[in-house]
């Protein structure tokens, strides 16, 4: 017979013959023959191939490296890849999340307009008049200034964006 | 990780690099491209991610394109409208936005008329 | 456009000693950065990682400090082998990923 030219899904073309391709989570050892079939052997511990493949190697599970924020979401299987996220307080660099950075602070002068997600880094935004951050936080929102009238004080220091108003006693006066 | 051979090209020529990896998936890892002019810096050109998402430096946005094919497991980088200052030597390695362990040894690409 | 400034472009230091490269962000990017070692005719290898945690391999005589917008890398006990370009690379973001402009060090 005429050797084929294609094969079947999940079978591959070798030496002129089609020989079946291995499942997912084994690797192959040798391509069939004439008289035998192909030869797979299950992927090693902390090994994984997702796929019908006619690959000599396992690929190896990824590493969620501690030291770039990444933690373990699901442990791998021989059939599926460790699927990293990152620590509390830390966030993906890119959609594909192979690293991650810790959240940022708002500076003095800026507040949260936004906390921080796992996806999306803090947004800060500038304390308006009337409002203040003396603090670097991902967390505190710009305060207002203390109202010194309803605390029957003036103010005797104007507030900025970085402090807060300094309210004093009322000149009393002299009779 | 290893990239094809460069070699001499001309100006407005366009350049085709392949990477081809090993050892792990592209459905797993990025793979981004940097290069280094003689005697200069490294310079990130751009990458793709695991997911296939394709990130450029700013003043290669116009003209690279970073492609991948996960069953070759290899990524290819292409750059239009050469000029000498494109002379360099041009490495892959593991890793779409993040940092670099693995390295190709590097490509020398020449630009000249 | 985000930039990376590294100072200085070149450091000599005895053998033994200590040298300090800084590296810094035109705007925040966290803990995002990390440091190269580059010798002629090689690719870089990965020293530091998150500002300041040592890749796997590397000598604990490099150590990187800073956060935000200031980074440094220092290199004590300086030997032989340490002669080599520095580079700092930020992967905040992609629109942050950069290498700066590199740091050659000569030791004597």
């Known amino acids: 017979p005429e050797p084929p030219t294609a094969c079947r899904e999940k079978q591959y073309l070798i030496n002129s013959q089609c020989c079946s391709l291995c499942q997912p989570g084994q690797k192959l050892v040798s391509d069939c023959t004439e008289f035998t079939e192909t030869e797979c052997l299950p992927c090693g511990e902390s090994e994984f191939l997702d796929t019908w493949n006619r690959e000599t190697h396992c690929h190896q599970h990824k590493y969620c490296d501690p030291n770039l924020g990444l933690r373990v979401q699901q442990k791998g299987t021989s059939e599926t890849d460790t699927i990293c996220t990152c620590e509390e307080g830390w966030h993906c660099t890119s959609e594909a999340c192979e690293s991650c950075v810790l959240h940022r602070s708002c500076s003095p002068g800026f507040g949260v307009k936004q906390i921080a997600t796992g996806v999306s880094d803090t947004i800060c935004e500038p304390c308006p008049v009337g409002f203040f951050s003396n603090v670097s936080s991902a967390f505190e929102k710009c305060h207002p200034w203390t109202s010194c009238e309803t605390k029957d004080l003036v103010v005797q220091q104007a507030g900025t964006n970085k402090t807060d108003v300094v309210c004093g006693p009322q000149d009393r006066l002299r009779a | 990780v290893k990239e094809s051979e460069g070699g001499l090209f001309k100006p407005k020529d366009t350049l085709t690099l392949t990477c081809t990896v090993s050892g792990f998936s592209l459905s797993s890892y990025g793979v981004s491209w940097v290069r280094q002019a003689p005697g200069n810096g490294l310079e990130w050109i751009g990458g793709i991610g695991s997911d296939g998402s394709a990130y450029y430096a700013s003043w290669a946005k116009s003209r690279a394109t970073i492609t991948r094919d996960t069953n070759l497991k290899t990524v290819t980088l292409e750059m239009t409208s050469l000029t000498a200052a494109d002379t360099a030597t041009y490495f892959c390695?593991?890793?779409?936005?993040?940092?670099?362990?693995?390295w190709g040894p590097g490509t020398l690409v020449t630009v000249s008329s | 456009a985000f930039e990376l400034t590294q100072t200085p472009a070149s450091v000599e230091a005895a053998m033994g000693g200590t040298v300090t490269i800084k590296c810094q962000a035109s705007?925040?990017?966290?803990?995002?950065l990390a440091w190269y070692q580059q010798k002629p005719g090689q690719p870089p290898k990965l020293l530091i990682v998150g500002a300041s945690n040592l890749a796997s391999g590397v000598s604990s005589r490099f150590k990187g400090s800073g956060s935000g917008t200031e980074f440094t890398l220092s290199i004590s006990d300086l030997e032989c082998a340490d002669g080599a370009t520095y580079y700092c690379?930020?992967?905040?973001?992609?629109?942050?990923?950069?290498f700066g402009g590199g740091t050659e060090v000569v030791v004597k």
């Open positions: 705007q925040s990017i966290s803990n995002g």
């Open positions: 690379q930020s992967y905040f973001s992609s629109s942050s990923t950069v």
């Open positions: 390695a593991r890793g779409g936005i993040t940092v670099y362990a693995m």
